[in-house]
Interface confidence: low
Amino acid sequence: PEPPTACREKQYLINSQCCSLCQPGQKLVSDCTEFTETECLPCGESEFLDTWNRETHCHQHKYCDPNLGLRVQQKGTSETDTICTCEEGWHCTSEACESCVLHRSCSPGFGVKQIATGVSDTICEPCPVGFFSNVSSAFEKCHPWTSCETKDLVVQQAGTNKTDVVCGPQDRLRA
């Protein structure tokens, strides 16, 4: 018979014959022959392969380096990599979560819309008219301007998104 030019799913072509791929969690030790099946071996501890493969070496599990603020979210298996996340108080710098940074502060003029979590950073929003924030904070929302009227005072200086209004005494009309 003609040697195959293509193989079925979960097979690979070598030396003009189709060999079975190794299943996830196992690595290739030796290709199949006319007389023997593909030989595979399980990955060692702290190693994995997540696809049907013909790899001769398993991949090392990701190391969640505590010095980078990382901790293990999900322990790796022979078929899956370790998933890292950040310690509380930090957030991942990328989707792959290779390192962590302190939660972002919202600059003056911005308030915290949503406090950060282990996987998402602080969400800031601009202070709307009538509100202000004069500090850089990872916690504080925009504060409303002081109401001078309720204190029987008048606005001497208008507020901005970064400063409160300044209240002062009402001008007394002279008789």
Epitope: W90, V101, L102, H103, S136, A138, F139, E140
Partner: nanobody, 121 residues
Framework: EVQLLESGGGLVQPGGSLRLSCAAS????????MYWVRQAPGKGLEWVSS????????YYADSVKGRFTISRDNSKNTLYLQMNSLRAEDTAVYYC??????????????WGQGTLVTVSS
């Protein structure tokens, strides 16, 4: 020059209490969110607790929630950590830290020198 000086650490039995203090100087303490972090022997840094500038908002790691209380006295430029029901796993060097204003690429801009808390019978 910014300085953060922790005190109050020591040897305590499991179930005991300690109160850590952190005296701050060289910056406007009342406008700075502050943090306690710790490092157990041979381990990485672990965030313990945070407090906003007014003391109105406090945050805790799950491992210390209900046992530790963070507070501050802005008139004394001092940060506190009241630690109750201490466990062996709380053994660590405790650092107070000042949050960086621009925190895109760094965690804290200033640290104290740390105070050692040992929980052992």
């Amino acid at each position: 020059e910014v300085q953060l000086l922790e005190s109050g650490g020591g040897l305590v039995q499991p179930g005991g209490s300690l109160r850590l203090s952190c005296a701050a100087s060289g910056f406007t303490f009342k406008t700075s969110p502050m943090y306690w972090v710790r490092q157990a022997p041979g381990k990485g840094l672990e965030w313990v607790s945070s407090i906003d500038r007014t003391g109105g908002h406090t945050y805790y790691a799950d491992s210390v929630k209900g046992r530790f209380t963070i507070s501050r006295d802005n008139s004394k430029n001092t940060l506190y950590l009241q630690m109750n029901s201490l466990r062996a796993e709380d053994t660590a060097v405790y650092y107070c830290a000042k949050q960086a204003l621009l925190t895109d690429a760094k965690r804290f801009d200033y640290w104290g020198q740390g105070t050692l808390v040992t929980v052992s019978s």
